[in-house]
Structure formats: C-alpha cells, structure tokens
Amino acid sequence: QNASRGRRQRRMHPNVSQGCQGGCATCSDYNGCLSCKPRLFFVLERIGMKQIGVCLSSCPSGYYGTRYPDINKCTKCKVDCDTCFNKNFCTKCKSGFYLHLGKCLDSCPEGLEANNHTMECVSIVHCEASEWSPWSPCMKKGKTCGFKRGTETRVRDILQHPSAKGNLCPPTSETRTCIVQRKKCSKGERGKKGRERKRKKLNKEERKETSSSSDSKGLESSIETPDQQENKERQQQQKRRARDKQQKSVSVSTVH
C-alpha cells in the first residue's frame, strides 16, 4: 500500500500507513485512524479545533455503533437524544424532552403524562379503591354497650395511587350514626366507668347525644333533621314525666 508514492497519490491521499497504534487498521499522521481493526468502531474525536480518528471497542455517549461489512462506525444519536440504541430508538432524551416509544418529544401525546423524574411519557393512572369493608359494630367511646345512639364506621383501601393527571382518590372511611337496643354493660365491660355511669345516669339521659364523621369529600352527613330533633324532645319529656310520677310531685309541662 505504501510502495507507490507517485505525484498523484501525494496529491489525492494523506500518507496512509498500516503500522498504526491503538486499534487502527490504517492511519495517517494528520488524521489519526482512517479505518479500524475488526469489531472496533471508528469515531472522530474533537481535540481542540482538530478532529482525529480513533478506534474504540464501544461508542461514547450520544453515539450508537453501526456495523457494515468490515467497516464499523460510531454514529451520532438524533439531536434531541442523549443515548440511543440505533438511529430510530432513543433510550434517554436530552434535557427538556420526554421519551416515548424510543422517540424524544417536547410534550407527551394525549392520554399520556410527563414523568419529570424519569423524563418519560407514561400512562395516566387513576386512583383505584377496594370495596367497602362491612360496617363496624355500633360503638360509643370505644364501647358497644351502655348507650343507645353511637357511630359505626366502614373503610376501604387504596389499591392504586393516581399519577399527576389521574383521578383523585375517594375517601377511605365513612362514619354514620346508629341506634341500638340499649343493653347494660356487663361487669367486665363496665369497670370504673360503668359505676360512674350509674351515678350520672340522670344527667347523661338529659345530655344530647350526637355523632359525626363526614369525610372532607362530603359523604353521608350525620346531622339530625328537625323531625328527629322533635322526636327526641318528646321522648325526653316523656321520661321526665315518668320520673315526676315516681317522685309523686306534680309539675306543669309545656309542649314545645
């Protein structure tokens, strides 16, 4: 190859040599590598203002390897792509672009949303909740006895949390008032509180019983209607009358 160095060859071609270093098959003083040994990839390396050919076993970031018969080269990924598998398949986009099916997009297609952590277009995920649990026993202050009006609760789990553009999750608990046939607490259940309850029974009967637990999302309200309040007042009056008869004292009662 180097044998002939006629006028035409000097004009047309830089000095080509096969006594090269670092993976070059052919090289020149001015250009560095011209071609590479088998399985190595040619790439132009920018050194200051100069570009010289080098031969590498794998391509640098921003390039992918192209193989043709006896000639391999590192080829630049597309302008918006940082790392690619081949010309048409990007695996990491440059800043400000989102990856979708191997392409780099400045905004995600309809039905998809940008994940700003992975810089990928991902499917919009809506919240998914489980079925409601059964209602809990009717309780008041952690007890299921010694009262007539209490609250019961049911819950559900979040099976799938939503993505940024997904539907928000519904409430995970629901509470409502409940009325039970009043039963006395057994000795074990009563304890100190049970004895106190006996002493304060009359006062407690007078006290208005309320219950609440409505989620911020606005589920069932436990506020009583005017009819319910009127009923309650009647019941309380009847109870007072019965006590008054027992005490053999006469009182005048006014109906509200």
């Epitope: 047309m12 006896d70 080269k73 080829t75």
Partner: antibody, heavy 119, light 107 residues
Framework: EVQLQESGPSLVKPSQTLSLTCSVT????????WSWIRKFPGNKLEFMGY???????YYIPSLKSRVSITRDTSKNQYYLQLNSVTTEDTATYYC?????????????WGQGTLVTVSS | DIKMTQSPSSMYASLGERVTITCKAS??????LSWFQQKPGKSPKTLIY???RLIDGVPSRFSGSGSGQDYSLTINSLEYEDMGIYYC?????????FGAGTRLEIK
C-alpha cells in the same frame, strides 16, 4: 501511483447481465474498500456497493437483489455484475476506492465506462 | 437513505468572484461530507473531505465548512479552470449518497 481502470462491453441488451472489471495498480485490493458508482445521463451519481479488503460486500438496498461484486486478488481486480438490466441502467460506470472514515472517500476513480442498455 | 439537497442546481459566476455552493442533509451527518469536482469527459476529483479538509494539491481558494445538516463549499476567487459540476457526498451512513450536483459556468 494508484490507478483504477474499468473495462467491459459498452452495449448490453435488456434482461441480460452487465459485467464490468476494475483493474487496480499501485495498491492492493486486500487493503481498503473497492466500490462501484454510476452516473446517469441526467448527471445523478449513485453509489452501488463495495467489496472490502477481506472480500465482504455491501450493496445498496435498491440493487441488492440483482447486483454482485466479486474479486480476484491474484489479478488485483474486482468485478461488477448487474442482472436483468433495463434501459434505466444506462449510465457511466466508475470504480473508486477509499480507505475508511478518517480519510477521503473515493480519493481515486477510474476514468469511467459508458454502458448503454438497448435492444 | 439520507437525502442530500444541493443548491443551486446551476449558476453563472464571473472570474475573481466568490462562489458558494450549499448542501443540506435530511439528518445530521456529523461532518462526514466530501466535495467533488467533475469536468466534462473526466472522472470526479475529490476536493474536500470531513467537511473542511483539503486534499493535497487542491488550490487553497477552495474551502469547506458546516456541521449538523448544513454544509457549504466556497471558491474564494473564481478561476476559469473551476468550471464544472460540483457534488457533495455524505458518508455518515450507508448507503452513501450524493447531492444532485451544481453546474458552475463562467459568465
């Protein structure tokens, strides 16, 4: 001095095979890449393919089914065969060489041979 | 295939004039671009490779520049012997492809 010289028939009948030879002096075909290029009457240049220093070949997709490039290292010659020619294959055929991506592509050309496809 | 769009397709210029021919690739070709000159009845002759590297023996009035998709060949002061057809070639990717050519004639 590296020189390339094309030879072969200047007239080929449609449906026949076009066969050309490129004789190389001043360099060995066991080094570098040895190509065929053609120039159509409207001045359009088309690269057709190459045979490498080891004898491996590359053909452009549009010609792959009917082109073949072979070589004879003992004669330092390489060859072009184009099957099932039509009048569209009328062109000046050149052989040319290059040494790789870091150097000039097609630094050396043959003088070209005009092949007319006509019945 | 990468398409090379060369312009103008033909031009007339005066001796001593500065002439510029451009080539636009359909995608980034990373500086793998050559320029050729072909005169009537002759084979093409390489002028420039890797965008801006002048072949030994080519007059210094020829220069090349560009990057990405856009490249140009400039003849600083046109001489009579510069008439002919000029072609660009991309060799970033196979199949390598040529521009359609620019016919340069002297006014």
């Amino acid at each position: 001095e590296v020189q390339l010289q094309e030879s072969g028939p200047s007239l080929v009948k449609p449906s026949q095979t076009l066969s050309l030879t490129c004789s190389v002096t001043g360099d060995s075909i066991t080094s570098g890449y040895w190509s065929w290029i053609r120039k159509f009457p409207g001045n359009k240049l088309e690269f057709m393919g190459y045979i490498s220093f080891s004898g491996k070949t590359y053909y452009i997709p549009s010609l792959k089914s009917r082109v073949s490039i072979t070589r004879d290292t003992s004669k330092n010659q390489y060859y072009l065969q184009l099957n099932s020619v039509t009048t569209e294959d009328t062109a000046t055929y050149y052989c040319a060489t290059y040494h790789g991506y870091g150097g000039p592509w097609f630094a050396y050309w043959g003088q070209g041979t005009l092949v007319t496809v006509s019945s | 295939d990468i398409k090379m769009t060369q312009s103008p397709s033909s031009m007339y210029a005066s001796l001593g004039e500065r002439v510029t021919i451009t080539c636009k690739a359909s995608q980034d070709i990373d500086s793998y671009l050559s320029w050729f000159q072909q005169k009537p009845g002759k084979s093409p002759k390489t002028l420039i490779y890797l965008t801006n590297r002048l072949i030994d023996g080519v007059p210094s009035r020829f220069s090349g520049s560009g990057s990405g998709q856009d490249y140009s060949l400039t003849i600083n002061s046109l001489e009579y012997e510069d008439m002919g057809i000029y072609y660009c070639l991309q060799y970033d990717e196979f199949p390598v492809t040529f521009g359609a050519g620019t016919r340069l004639e002297i006014k």
